[in-house]
Interface confidence: medium
């Protein structure tokens, strides 16, 4: 092989446009064609003032979570690709995102990927006929719940109609109608389940997130091939623009341990 003449490869960030419904996971892929042994990969959101706000980072095989744990960075097994996911996206997550690779001092180099746009749309109970992104993990359950609730409501309406007919035809029997109804097990589900669906989706999602601080990683084809290990790292500094000066303190702890001195 002659001396390699590949240029130092830029980053790619895909898809360029991503649309998800609120509550779904939004996943971008940041890819580096070449990866060094020592680097930092940052995930940014572009603020309205065109500043880069750091969401999360990957450094020396450690995930460095940001303030908001919904933003996840996962290294895929090939070492070059990184999934950058927003767990349970919110409407205000819509915006411009990018990733940046920082090759560490003394010869600091910073590469930024092209920008990508995320659109988070309002959730509708009826799923769109053509989904622009992979369905979320909950979609099947949600569909089942919607069908279930619809069935219960139809059942309740039919029962009310039947009660009304009975009341009209047998006026004396109206006193006993409620008793008969209360013994019918499926009917119990109606009043019990109904309040859940009066909740605003966002509120429901919030309660779930409070109970489970580490929601499952986004569903991906590679899911069975790798594990996301979130290490407790230093608190990230969101809103700080990556620069050579800010990196002097970001030198990773020396990975001098481990068999064979392997780095990553």
């Amino acid at each position: 092989l002659d001396s390699p003449d590949r240029p130092w490869s830029p980053l790619t960030f895909s898809p360029a446009q991503l649309t998800v419904q609120e509550g779904e996971n939004a996943t971008f892929t940041c890819s580096l064609a070449d990866i060094p042994d020592s680097f930092v990969l940052n995930w940014y959101r572009l603020s309205p003032r065109n500043q880069t706000d750091k969401l999360a980072a990957f450094q020396e095989d450690r995930i460095e979570p940001g303030r908001d744990r919904r933003f996840r960075v996962t290294r895929l097994p090939n070492g070059r690709d990184f999934h950058m996911s927003i767990v349970a996206a919110r409407l205000n997550d819509s915006g411009i995102y990018l990733c940046g690779a920082i090759y560490l001092p003394p010869n600091t180099q910073i590469n930024e990927s092209p920008r990508a746009e995320l659109s988070v749309t309002e959730r509708t109970l009826e799923p769109p006929t053509q989904s622009p992104s992979p369905p979320p993990r909950l979609s099947g359950q949600l569909q089942g719940l919607v069908i279930g609730v619809t069935s219960v409501l139809v059942g309740v309406l039919l029962l009310l109609l039947l009660t009304w007919v009975l009341a009209a035809v047998f006026p004396r029997a109206t006193r006993g109608a409620c008793v008969c109804g209360s013994e019918d097990e499926p009917l119990k589900e109606g009043p019990d389940a109904a309040p859940v669906f009066t909740l605003d989706y966002g509120e429901l999602d919030f309660q779930w997130r409070e109970k489970t601080p580490e929601p499952p990683a986004p569903c991906a084809p590679e899911q069975t091939e790798y594990a996301t290990i979130v290490f407790p790292g230093r608190p990230a500094s969101p809103g700080r623009r990556a620069s050579a000066s800010s990196l002097q303190g970001a030198q990773p702890p020396s990975p001098e341990d481990g068999p064979g001195l392997w780095p990553l």
Epitope: I35, P36, D37, P105, Y226, L261, W262
Partner: antibody
């Protein structure tokens, strides 16, 4: 354009010394672990030594331990191999490389090699 | 030291035909991290070596998908689905889990 250019190879007498250099360009040298690999002409590859990104961690093949020293100057994008007490069996083409061993990085660059001949 | 043994030591294949090279390690190359530190290199006549595959299955940038790596633990294989004239050279496997890092003795691929 990514390049690794070795130099310093020469004909030297047994017991003599040499310093090999490898100048890197076109990629963030200071972020890569560097390796020296040698090859006796017509024979296989043999790992010689390795230095991590910061320069403080090094490792050597048993055959060269105590005689060779690997070092790097990240400010100059240069990798070195100081060779003392040279023996006839050190005669080989010496390559500097990245992404050889030990690494999981998704890139590997090799120089063209510099020839060291140890003969009386 | 981990000994890497390649078979066959030479191979003659016609263009368009498949080729397969085996590499056996004297001990497992699987690390507790889940990574297996096995690499494949090719050296064309009169040139420097080039890495083709890292961590058993991942191709280096620019390496055609005709090349594929497989295996686990101690037994590994490099396959070329359809050999081309340009594939001639010596193929080496190498391990990166334990110092000293070792290479196989090489397999010479000749195109008929």
């Amino acid at each position: 354009q990514v390049q690794l250019v070795e130099s310093g190879g020469d004909l030297v007498k047994p017991g003599g010394s040499l310093r090999l250099s490898c100048v890197a360009s076109g990629f963030p040298f200071s972020s890569f672990h560097m390796t020296w690999v040698r090859q006796v002409p017509g024979m296989g590859l043999q790992w010689v030594a390795y230095v991590k990104t910061g320069g403080s961690s090094t490792s050597y093949a048993d055959a060269v331990k105590g005689r060779f020293t690997i070092s790097r100057d990240n400010a100059k994008n240069t990798l070195y191999l100081h060779m003392n007490s040279l023996r006839a069996e050190d005669t080989a083409l010496y390559y500097c490389a990245t992404g050889v061993v030990p690494t999981t990085v998704a890139s590997s660059y090799w120089g063209q090699g510099t020839l060291v001949t140890v003969s009386s | 030291d981990i000994v890497m043994t390649q078979t066959p030591l030479s191979l003659s294949v016609s263009p368009g035909e498949p080729a397969s090279i085996s590499c056996k390690a004297s001990q497992s190359l699987l690390h507790s991290s889940g990574y297996t530190y096995l690499y494949w290199f090719r050296q064309k006549p009169g040139q420097s070596p080039q890495r083709l595959v890292y961590k058993v299955v991942y191709r280096d940038p620019g390496v055609p998908d005709r090349f594929s790596g497989s295996g686990s633990g101690t037994d590994f294989t490099l396959r070329i689905s359809r050999v081309e004239a340009d594939d001639a050279g010596v193929y080496y496997c190498g391990q990166g889990i334990k110092d000293p890092f070792t290479f196989g003795q090489g397999t010479k691929l000749e195109i008929k």
